[in-house]
């Protein structure tokens, strides 16, 4: 008799999830010599231990503490780049500007990027059929709690000037419900962080509006100012040129506004 299985609204665990996490862990230690002390088997055990045999709507930040401990990593606190709804460009940027880091450039973010996972209460099985959706099922699911946990720590580590890349093509350029808006903004430490600098990325080639005047950006400025952190904002009108100028800052065309 087939066992009854809870059907969730979201996609199931990414196929070959354990193998992917282990392979990414090994790859990360290859790219980052300072992390070669990392024991990838222990990392996988800690990752698995956070959600296996647990109800996928009842996951806590505490469940991820063993993994967080294993993935502890020093990042230059003044070189942090946050992003919201514009991951690909943020990652392209840090691939060029090697001294700046997004969460996905850190071990734990690198391991989990673009993956989905969940288990089932009281069984050691990984659920490859479906996982809880944040809106339709529950917010305390393994993936959401993971990103909340690591995003909070990442924001807490930041100092001096923190940069955030925002998508100017969205109706809400700053979204209070995004991870940036709901977690990272509130975990920047005013005693360490002097300024949050927003880079608003324009989508249309002919878009010359000052998106720093957008009401949602003003809302972000208000939240940040109330936390005793200064706020500044820049329009990135030409993201392609922006990346090109990061690669080749000496280029004569890079002195004009991008």
């Amino acid at each position: 008799v087939p066992r009854w299985r809870q059907q969730w609204s979201g996609p199931g665990t990414t196929k070959r999830f354990p193998e992917t996490v282990l392979a990414r862990c090994v790859k990360y230690t290859e790219i980052h010599p300072e992390m070669r002390h990392v024991d990838c088997q222990s990392v996988w055990d800690a990752f698995k231990g956070a959600f296996i045999s647990k109800h996928p709507c009842n996951i806590t930040e505490e469940d991820y503490q063993p993994l967080v401990k294993l993935g502890t990593q020093t990042v230059p606190c003044n070189k942090i780049l946050l992003w919201s709804r514009i991951k690909d460009l943020a990652h392209q940027f840090t691939q060029v500007q090697r001294d700046m880091f997004t969460l996905e450039d850190m071990l734990l973010g690198y391991l989990a990027d673009d993956l989905t996972w969940c288990g089932e209460f009281n069984t050691s099985k990984i659920n490859y059929q479906s996982c809880p959706d944040w809106r339709k099922d529950c917010s305390n699911n393994p993936v959401s709690v993971f990103w909340k946990t690591v995003s909070r720590r990442f924001a807490e580590a930041a100092c001096d000037v923190v940069h955030v890349m925002l998508n100017g093509s969205r109706s809400k350029i700053f979204d209070k419900n995004s991870t940036f808006g709901s977690v990272e903004v509130h975990n920047l430490q005013p005693e360490k962080v002097q300024t949050l600098e927003a880079w608003v990325i324009h989508g249309g080639r002919e878009d010359s509006r000052d998106l720093c005047q957008d009401p949602t950006i003003k809302e972000l400025e208000s939240i940040i100012s109330k936390r005793n952190i200064q706020f500044s904002c820049k329009n990135i009108y030409r993201p392609d040129k922006f990346l090109q100028c990061v690669k080749n800052p000496e280029d004569s065309s890079c002195t004009s506004e991008i």
């Epitope: 862990c25 070669r36 002390h37 024991d39 990838c40 222990s42 063993p66 401990k69």
Partner: antibody
């Protein structure tokens, strides 16, 4: 089949420099993710890690001995060389080389048979 | 440096006995502990890594457990060929450090 073998002098005088060679087969340091380390064991005593080197020339040393140690590799000869300066009788020990592999932290899985080095005038 | 304190330093047991050796780390090493067997005049042999993973080809009578600072190595049924000195090692951080060893003898 991975094998490692240590070679070098059996006797060195105090203040001299010791040079040990680890020659290996079934393992290539031109392959990503591989490394070789050195460990020593004074007679009747515990093991002490000295240094290791990765395929990409990333090196790690025991801080207590760092000023005296140099680890290098010759990929074409399948060899790793450890030099230890200013030898003292307390450095008398069996010296082992061992393989390490990326992702396993610093777990040493294959070991050489060891070579006994005596420091005496 | 992380100190690895192993106990007992020596132990005598009979064939078929269950033998337990403990190792305490001076700070949290999560699960990054390996166990080695060394016979006289021979190189150490890896038995267990990452606290509880049996290395390839190691008999199932050998097992390891623990996390944080306290680790245990067990031989479920002692065999004559198990007579050796056993070492724990933390592979969590540099410098890698070993316990002082436990010499196992047959009664």
């Amino acid at each position: 089949q991975v094998t490692l073998k240590e070679s070098g002098p059996t006797l060195v005088k105090p203040t001299q420099t010791l040079t040990l060679t680890c020659t290996f087969s079934g393992l290539s340091l031109s392959t990503s993710g591989k490394g070789v380390g050195w460990i020593r064991q004074p007679p009747g005593k515990a093991l002490e890690w000295l240094a290791h080197i990765w395929w990409d020339d990333d090196k790690r040393y025991n801080p207590a001995l760092k000023s005296r140690l140099t680890i290098t590799k010759d990929t074409s000869k399948n060899q790793v060389v450890l030099t230890m300066t200013n030898m003292d009788p307390v450095d008398t020990a069996t010296y082992y080389c061992a393989r390490i592999e990326l992702g396993r932290s610093y777990v040493m899985d294959y070991w050489g048979q060891g070579t006994l080095v005596t420091v005496s005038s | 440096d992380i100190q690895m304190t192993q106990s007992p330093s020596s132990l005598s047991a009979s064939v078929g006995d269950r033998v337990t050796i403990t190792c305490q780390a001076s700070q949290d090493v999560i699960t990054s502990v390996a166990w080695f067997q060394q016979k006289p005049g021979k190189a150490p042999k890896l038995l267990i890594y990452s606290a509880s993973y049996r290395y390839t080809g190691v008999p199932s009578r050998f097992s390891g457990s623990g996390s944080g600072t306290d680790f245990t190595f067990t031989i479920s049924s002692l065999q004559p060929e198990d007579i050796a000195t056993y070492y724990c090692q933390q592979h969590y951080t540099i410098p890698l450090t070993f316990g002082q060893g436990t010499k196992l003898e047959i009664k």
